[in-house]
Interface confidence: medium
């Protein structure tokens, strides 16, 4: 179930997945929630005596059992991911941090009259992930009322330092407040030749687009279908970026599908989850568990309720079926996407719905009868 | 259109602009509304780009420069290229587009009448070609829809001008002996219409020609009257498929 409480002066031991810098525990919890494997986190609000670079450290963790041993540590805050917290799920982070310099790659500097104006500039710049604003009281006159737009490979600061009269915050694109616009176009049989920032395996271009939308540096994508001539690239989703923020003109390429990230959308922004169940498809990955259930929908529900499950394959092969149902393999991977997709007539596959805002359940508490 | 003049809004309400939307958007061809959900155009427009998703169809438009990302457009539901069309031969240069959603007819956007099969030998005297294409061989797409009146040329005479090509009975030629007025690049797929017995008919689909508006080189058009059966059959079979897949 949903565990939203935070534990003060507590640090989880072991289970380390990744470490990033975040300005507070709430932001750290959000980063853990949207990380494919993170279940627990520990945040250092105060730096240990000899390790000043550890302050603002957000340590993302996983555990087979869903819990880790707790140790007392002054200034540490720990908690759980909100992966199963339905209505509390949001990537939007509107808080402003006074006296903090969130560092990253400064790609633009301009004069603005207010912190709100600076945040708006960041929200409406395709590359901006976070910003720092120097107030009129900043110690260096030439930087006063300057708005620095920033980015990094992870989408989070590369370090955070306390500096008087600096104010920092995040882009509000994830709050659906960007005015950049929302390019919904999907180009069948066209490929973008721009810089790849990452690649994942996906069953179709729509999942690819959602993955791109929630990747910190993906602006557009090219997905190669199962018919693509290079076997190693079949069902591969290439996440792309460019200096200009726009793709170069697409090139005609049979069995390629291209499109844009929807991270600047206001209304059409997708949820970070994929509802569709793909029949005739098997998702490969690290096996978590196998149960026997009746139907692919029930398999998806089992995966959704199993917090570490990222995707599943339901098999209808005679040897995989018993009286109580057929085999439901619960799986996971490092990036949350299948390691490989194969086509098998007797299989159905899909994803956990743990990151959907409202998880649909087949059993409703109130039944409304149609007239 | 070479040697043409500006049209006015609603003068040719069946004319549409077929545009390809990639990173930028460009007018590629013309087309004609023949039904609420149907556009008739040239098959060669889709050579190398037979992907319905990238095409956008604009009706009720006079000036292409007024198209913005807010301008409504139609998308292709089904692209039907004549099964015998081969790029290297130029015959059967005809395609039907079924639109995703039916068009609303207005005074600026309505269909053109198709000729009947009996019109294969009709002599038309008042014919016009329209489009946003080049105004010279080495030119550029025009913003305002151009129009030009143009006389039909008998096939035997047309064949004499094109010794290297076969002018089939499924083609119709139009042009002036001295040149100067003709369709050109970007007018492809658009209409050659003639007024007969008080109404406009779609007589030809802009297809090909040696250069543009050259002396003794008429424009060659797909003769619509020769394809009436094909058009009706394709529209009918599309309707039947829709009935098969519609909910009970």
């Amino acid at each position: 179930g949903c565990l939203s409480q935070l534990y003060a002066n507590t640090f989880f031991r072991g289970g380390d997945l990744a470490a990033i810098y975040t300005p507070d525990a709430q932001h750290c919890q959000k980063m853990c929630t949207f990380h494919p494997r993170c279940l627990l986190f520990s945040f250092l609000a105060v730096s240990p005596t000899k390790e000043t670079d550890k302050r603002f450290g957000c340590f993302m963790k996983e555990s087979i059992t869903g819990t880790l041993p707790r140790i007392h540590r002054t200034g540490a805050i720990s908690g759980h991911s909100l992966k199963q917290c339905g209505h509390q799920l949001s990537a939007c982070h509107q808080d402003i941090y006074e006296g903090l310099d969130m560092r990253g790659s400064n790609f633009n500097i301009s004069k603005t009259d207010s912190i709100e104006e600076c945040q708006k500039l960041c929200t409406n710049n395709i590359h901006c992930q976070f910003f720092t604003y120097a107030t009129k009281a900043f110690h260096r006159p030439e930087y006063r009322k300057s708005c620095l737009l920033k980015r990094s490979s992870s989408g989070t600061p590369t370090s955070i330092k306390p500096v008087d009269n600096l104010v920092s915050g995040f882009s509000l694109k994830s709050c659906a407040l960007s005015e950049i616009g929302c390019p919904m176009d999907i180009f069948q049989h066209f490929a973008f030749a721009d810089l790849n920032v990452s690649h994942v395996v996906t069953p179709d271009a729509f999942v690819c687009r959602t993955v791109c939308t929630f990747h910190p540096n993906c602006l557009f994508f090219t997905f190669y279908t199962n018919e693509w001539e290079t076997e190693s690239q079949r069902n591969v989703c290439f996440l792309k970026t460019s200096k200009s923020g726009r793709p170069s003109p697409p090139i005609i390429q049979e069995n390629a599908v291209s499109g844009y990230s929807l991270f600047t959308c206001r209304k059409a922004r997708p949820e970070p989850c994929h509802f569709k169940i793909y029949s005739g498809v098997a998702f490969e990955g690290e096996e978590l568990n196998a149960t026997f259930v009746q139907g692919a929908d029930a398999c998806q529900e089992t995966c959704t309720k199993t917090i570490r499950c990222q995707f599943f394959t339901y098999s209808l092969l005679p040897q995989d079926c018993k009286a109580e149902g057929c085999k439901c393999s619960l799986r996971l991977s490092t990036d949350g996407s299948p390691t490989r997709i194969t086509y098998e007539a007797q299989g159905s596959s899909g994803y956990s719905l743990r990151l959907c805002k409202v998880v649909e359940s087949s059993d409703c508490t109130t039944k409304i009868n149609a007239r | 259109i070479v040697g043409g003049t500006n049209s006015s809004l609603g003068e040719w309400p069946w004319q549409v602009s077929l545009q390809v939307k990639l990173v930028s958007q460009n007018h590629m061809c013309g087309g004609s509304i023949i039904g609420r959900q149907w556009i008739l155009t040239a098959a060669h427009c889709f050579d190398g780009i037979p992907y319905p998703d990238v095409w956008r169809i604009y009706g009720g438009i006079l000036n292409l420069s007024e198209i913005t990302n807010k301008t409504p457009f139609s998308s292709i539901k089904e692209l039907i290229i004549h099964q015998k069309y081969k790029m290297s031969e130029g015959s059967y240069d005809i395609a039907l587009i079924k639109l995703q959603t039916p068009l609303n007819y207005t005074e600026f956007q309505k269909p053109i009448c198709l000729p009947s099969k009996a019109d294969t030998n009709t002599i038309y005297t008042n014919c016009w070609v329209t489009g946003w294409g080049y105004t010279k061989e080495r030119g550029e797409t025009q913003n305002i829809l151009q129009k030009a009146t143009i006389p039909l040329v008998p096939n035997e005479e047309c064949q004499k001008k094109y010794r290297d090509y076969v002018i089939t009975k499924q083609m119709i030629c139009a042009g002036y002996k001295e040149g100067g007025i003709d369709a050109c690049k970007g007018d492809s797929g658009g209409p050659l219409v003639c007024k007969h017995s008080g109404r406009w008919q779609l007589v030809g689909i802009t297809s090909w020609g040696e250069g543009c508006a050259r002396k003794e080189q008429p424009g060659v058009y797909t003769k619509v009257a020769e394809y009436i059966d094909w058009i009706l059959e394709k529209i009918q079979s599309s309707k039947e498929r829709a009935l098969e897949t519609s909910p009970a």
Epitope: - | C45, G48, V166, C184, K185, D187, T206, W208
Partner: antibody, heavy 126, light 107 residues
Framework: EVQLLESGGGLVQPGGSLRLSCAAS????????MIWVRQAPGKGLEWVSY????????TYADSVKGRFTISRDNSKNTLYLQMNSLRAEDTAVYYC???????????????????WGQGTLVTVSS | DIQMTQSPSSLSAFVGDRVTITCRAS??????LNWYHQKPGKAPKLLIY???RLQSGVPSRLSGSGFGTDFTLTISSLQPEDFGNYYC?????????FGGGTKVEIR
Amino acid sequence: EVQLLESGGGLVQPGGSLRLSCAASGFTFSAYSMIWVRQAPGKGLEWVSYIRPSGGRTTYADSVKGRFTISRDNSKNTLYLQMNSLRAEDTAVYYCARGGLLLWFRELKSNYFDYWGQGTLVTVSS
Amino acid sequence: DIQMTQSPSSLSAFVGDRVTITCRASQPIDNYLNWYHQKPGKAPKLLIYAASRLQSGVPSRLSGSGFGTDFTLTISSLQPEDFGNYYCQQSYTVPYTFGGGTKVEIR
């Protein structure tokens, strides 16, 4: 299957003449434009001459104009290149090729060369 | 005459690499540009016509783009059989001119 086979190449002295032939099969020869292209040893491609399907219109590169003549015999499915007043700089492999697009579509025109022969070597040397 | 300038004149790449060759015309040529591939001792082979249209039988890892004066040939994932020389050619006006060629070697 489309096939083009050149012949008639060889060694010739400067000022001499040669006649190249290109035998075509596997397509309706009389319906296609034909082209000669040459390639000097270790160099790039150079377009030489072009002839329309009926033979009614021909064009030449400036470097060969007045010395070379392109012709065709549609009854024999053969293309020819008569080369007179040959110079050392005419030394090359000569390819015949088929013109790919017959029509000047109103939205597409490209005189591309879709099938090529294997070439015949012409050496002009004293 | 229209001059066609290709770059680079040669390149060396690994199997699986994305390779891009550019061709620039000395004056605008609309989309009247073709690309050919030639292996040593063999005749050239047509790859792409009218700037971006793939000749039938050519693998779709090859693609072309461009309009006016600047054109690009892209091989999305270089294969061993892709070595050799690549030429662009304009068909906008006679004389039809070729680029100087790009030699592609497999590392």
